[in-house]
C-alpha cells in the first residue's frame, strides 16, 4: 500500500504523541552522545514538517523516504565530526548506504555516565514542573544507553514510568511507593533490552532464516493449537516487525506491531485460548501482554512425529520440494509437543534432522539411512538437562552471590583476555539464572535457563565484537547461534594465556567501599576475584576461596574501624602480602 507521503502516513497512523516519542528514540539510538536539548529540537522540527505533509501530501519533500528525511536531519548536527569522529563520514553517503552506516556505528557500550537516581522529592518536583520533558528525558536516557531497545516496548515502559510518578508523588510515603516500582522498571528494562539485542543479533549476524526458525519454535510452543499455516503467518509478520526495529525503522515497526496485535486478537480462536485478557487491554499493554503470554495447552492425542518425518515414503520428496517449509513443519510439530525444551535445543534438533536428510536423501537407500535419526536427538536433549541439573544443585548449595563467583572463576579461566568489567557483568548475569530458573519444576527449567543463557551470552558477544581480544570468544559467537552456549560450556582453561603482571593498585581499596550498596560492594569484590584469576589462572578453588574470605573479613573490619582510611591502607598491604603468599605469586 504505497502512500504519497510516508511521513504523513506514519504520523496519522501513530498519532502525534507516539510519533514524537518514536522519532526521539530513533535519534537517541543513532546519536548517543548528543545532548537532550539538541534531540528535542530535531524532533520538533521533524514533527512540524510531518504536520505540513499531513495537511498536503504533495508538499515539497513529503514524498521522501523516512531514512532520507531522518538522515538529512541527523546530518545537520553541527558537532558531528568532533563528537562522533568517523560516523560523520556516513553523511557523505546516499541512502540506503547512509542508514546502514549509522546502524554500524551504534555502540552497545557507550561512554556515558551511570544514571544516578536523584532524591524522590527532586524527581517528583521535576515531574510536576514539566511532565512532558521529564518523560522525554526518560526515553532519551534509556534509548541512548540501549541503542537496540525495542522501541514500541519502550513506549510501554514510559507509560508505566509515568503511572508510577503520577501515583507515588501523591502518596504519603513517596519513596516507599516509588522506589520499588523504579527498581522493577530498571530490572525489567535491562532484561527487555538484552532480549531484543539477541533478536537483532540473530537477524543481523545470522540472517532472516535464523530468526524465522527461532520464531517458529517459540510461537509453536506458545500456540500449540494453532495450525502450521497460522504460525507461519505470525512468523512472517513478527519477522517484519523486528527487522524494521533492528534496522532503525521505528515508525514502521511500531505501526506493524500494532497491526499484528490487532490481527492476533481478531483471530484468537485459531491461535490460543490464553489471549482473552491481553486482548481487552489498551494497545501498548496488549502488545506487551501478547509477547509474554503463557503457553496454551497442548492439543490432546497428537500423533507420533515419526509417521510424517521418518516412516513416510514421501520424506525426501517433501523435503526436496520445499526444504525450509518441510523443516519448518518439523520444527512446528516438535516445538508444539515440547514446551519443556529450550528454543535453542529445538533448533539444534531441527539442524540435526536437516543435516541427516541432506546426507540421506542423496544416498542409495534414503529410508535405511535416516530411519534412526530420532536416536541422534537423545544426547542433544540430555546435555542441557544434565548441565542444568548440576548447576541448579550448585546454585542451591552456594546461593546467588557465591554461584556468581564460581561462574566468574570458570569464565575467567576460559577467556581471561576479556575485559574485567565485561567478565563481571556477564558472569553476574549468568549467575542470575539460578534464582530465575532453578525454582521452576523440571518441565520449565530448560526453556527458562538455556534461552536466558542465550540472551546473556549474546551480551558477551556484542561487547566482545566492539573490541575483540579472544579468538575463542569470536569462534563461539560466530560459528553457530544455537550452539553458542554448548561452545562456551565446552571451553576448558586457556593454556595459552600468559598471566597478568601483578599490580598492587588493582587490590588497593579505600573507605568509599563502606558507603556502597550491597550490590556495588559485591561488584568490587567480584572485580578483585577476576583480577586474582587473571594473575593466577591455575589457582585452585580452595586458594581463591581463602583469599576471598580474607578479603571479605578485611572489608568488614575496616568498615567498622574508627579511622577507616588508615585501616584500609595498613590492613590492605597485609592482605595483599598474605594473598600473594597464599597464591604463590
Amino acid at each position: 500500500d504505497a502512500h504519497k507521503s510516508e511521513v504523513a502516513h506514519r504520523f496519522k497512523d501513530l498519532g502525534e504523541e507516539n510519533f514524537k516519542a518514536l522519532v526521539l528514540i530513533a535519534f537517541a539510538q543513532y546519536l548517543q552522545q548528543c545532548p537532550f536539548e539538541d534531540h528535542v529540537k530535531l524532533v520538533n522540527e521533524v514533527t512540524e514538517f510531518a504536520k505540513t505533509c499531513v495537511a498536503d501530501e504533495s508538499a515539497e519533500n513529503c514524498d521522501k523516504s523516512l531514512h532520507t528525511l531522518f538522515g538529512d536531519k541527523l546530518c545537520t548536527v553541527a558537532t558531528l565530526r568532533e563528537t562522533y569522529g568517523e560516523m560523520a563520514d556516513c553523511c557523505a553517503k546516499q541512502e540506503p548506504e547512509r542508514n546502514e552506516c549509522f546502524l554500524q556505528h551504534k555502540d552497545d557500550n557507550p561512554n556515558l555516565p551511570r544514571l544516578v537516581r536523584p532524591e524522590v522529592d527532586v524527581m517528583c518536583t521535576a515531574f510536576h514542573d514539566n511532565e512532558e520533558t521529564f518523560l522525554k528525558k526518560y526515553l532519551y536516557e534509556i534509548a541512548r544507553r540501549h541503542p537496540y531497545f525495542y522501541a514500541p516496548e519502550l513506549l510501554f515502559f514510559a507509560k508505566r514510568y509515568k503511572a508510577a510518578f503520577t501515583e507515588c508523588c501523591q502518596a504519603a510515603d513517596k519513596a516507599a511507593c516509588l522506589l520499588p516500582k523504579l527498581d522493577e522498571l530498571r530490572d525489567e528494562g535491562k532484561a527487555s533490552s538484552a532480549k531484543q539485542r539477541l533478536k537483532c543479533a540473530s537477524l543481523q549476524k545470522f540472517g532472516e532464516r535464523a530468526f524465522k526458525a527461532w520464531a517458529v519454535a517459540r510461537l509453536s510452543q506458545r500456540f500449540p493449537k494453532a495450525e502450521f499455516a497460522e504460525v507461519s503467518k505470525l512468523v512472517t509478520d513478527l519477522t517484519k516487525v523486528h527487522t524494521e526495529c533492528c534496522h532503525g525503522d521505528l515508525l514502521e515497526c511500531a505501526d506493524d506491531r500494532a497491526d499484528l496485535a490487532k490481527y492476533i486478537c481478531e483471530n484468537q480462536d485459531s491461535i490460543s485460548s490464553k489471549l482473552k485478557e491481553c486482548c481487552e487491554k489498551p494497545l501498548l499493554e496488549k502488545s506487551h501482554c501478547i509477547a509474554e503470554v503463557e503457553n496454551d495447552e497442548m492439543p490432546a492425542d497428537l500423533p507420533s512425529l515419526a509417521a510424517d518425518f521418518v516412516e513416510s515414503k514421501d520424506v525426501c520428496k517433501n523435503y526436496a520440494e520445499a526444504k525450509d517449509v518441510f523443516l519448518g513443519m518439523f520444527l512446528y510439530e516438535y516445538a508444539r509437543r515440547h514446551p519443556d525444551y529450550s528454543v535453542v535445543l529445538l533448533l539444534r534438533l531441527a539442524k540435526t534432522y536437516e543435516t541427516t536428510l541432506e546426507k540421506c536423501c542423496a544416498a542409495a537407500d534414503p529410508h535405511e539411512c535416516y530411519a534412526k535419526v530420532f536416536d541422534e536427538f537423545k544426547p542433544l536433549v540430555e546435555e542441557p538437562q544434565n548441565l542444568i541439573k548440576q548447576n541448579c544443585e550448585l546454585f542451591e548449595q552456594l546461593g546467588e552471590y557465591k554461584f556468581q563467583n564460581a561462574l566468574l572463576v570458570r569464565y575467567t579461566k576460559k577467556v581471561p583476555q576479556v575485559s574485567t568489567p565485561t567478565l563481571v557483568e556477564v558472569s553476574r548475569n549468568l549467575g542470575k539464572v539460578g534464582s530465575k530458573c532453578c525454582k521452576h519444576p523440571e518441565a520449565k527449567r530448560m526453556p527458562c535457563a538455556e534461552d536466558y543463557l542465550s540472551v546473556v551470552l549474546n551480551q558477551l558477544c556484542v561487547l566482545h565484537e566492539k573490541t575483540p581480544v579472544s579468538d575463542r570468544v569470536t569462534k563461539c559467537c560466530t560459528e553457530s547461534l544455537v550452539n553458542r552456549r554448548p561452545c562456551f560450556s565446552a571451553l576448558e582453561v586457556d593454556e595459552t594465556y600468559v598471566p597478568k603482571e601483578f599490580n598492587a593498585e588493582t587490590f588497593t581499596f579505600h573507605a568509599d567501599i563502606c558507603t556502597l550498596s550491597e550490590k556495588e560492594r559485591q561488584i568490587k569484590k567480584q572485580t578483585a576475584l577476576v583480577e586474582l584469576v587473571k594473575h593466577k589462572p591455575k589457582a585452585t578453588k580452595e586458594q581463591l576461596k581463602a583469599v576471598m574470605d580474607d578479603f571479605a573479613a578485611f572489608v568488614e573490619k575496616c568498615c567498622k574501624a574508627d579511622d577507616k582510611e588508615t585501616c584500609f591502607a595498613e590492613e590492605g598491604k597485609k592482605l595483599v602480602a598474605a594473598s600473594q603468599a597464599a597464591l604463590g605469586l
Partner: nanobody, 123 residues
Framework: EVQLVESGGGEVQPGGSLRLSCAAS????????MVWVRQAPGKGLEWVST????????VYAESVKGRFTISRDNAKNTVYLQMNSLRAEDTAVYYC????????????????RGQGTLVTVKP
C-alpha cells in the same frame, strides 16, 4: 510473476525417448525445489519426479524409476526430464511445477504450474 514454460513434448513410439525442458522465471530458481507432474486423459494429477534446489536430491515415482531422469541447470533457470523407454501409459500432459507459499507440500493443484506439454506414446 512466476512463469513456467514447458517444451519438448510430442508423439513417439513405445520404447522411444523425449527430453522435456521447463524455463522458469519470476522467482529465485536456485533456491527452489522443482517437480514434474502429469495428467493422463480423464485422470487426476500424478507426481512424476522431484529435484532439490541444488540437484543433490532426486526422487522418482515407482512407475518411472530407472526410465526417467530429472536434472536442472541453475545458470539457465531450467529443469529437464529425460524420458527413455516410453510406454503407452506415459501418455499425458506433463507439467513443470514449484511450491507455492501457503500451499501444502505435495498438493500439486496448488503449486505454480506451467501450461504443460503433451507427450503421446503410440505405435
Amino acid at each position: 510473476e512466476v512463469q513456467l514454460v514447458e517444451s519438448g513434448g510430442g508423439e513417439v513410439q513405445p520404447g522411444g525417448s523425449l527430453r522435456l525442458s521447463c524455463a522458469a522465471s519470476g522467482f529465485t530458481f536456485s533456491t527452489s525445489g522443482m517437480v514434474w507432474v502429469r495428467q493422463a486423459p480423464g485422470k487426476g494429477l500424478e507426481w512424476v519426479s522431484t529435484i532439490s534446489d541444488d540437484a543433490r536430491i532426486t526422487v522418482y515415482a515407482e512407475s518411472v524409476k530407472g526410465r526417467f531422469t530429472i536434472s536442472r541447470d541453475n545458470a539457465k533457470n531450467t529443469v529437464y526430464l529425460q524420458m527413455n523407454s516410453l510406454r503407452a501409459e506415459d501418455t499425458a500432459v506433463y507439467y513443470c511445477a514449484t511450491y507455492r507459499a501457503g500451499s501444502r507440500i505435495g498438493s500439486y493443484e496448488d503449486y505454480y504450474r506451467g501450461q504443460g506439454t503433451l507427450v503421446t506414446v503410440k505405435p
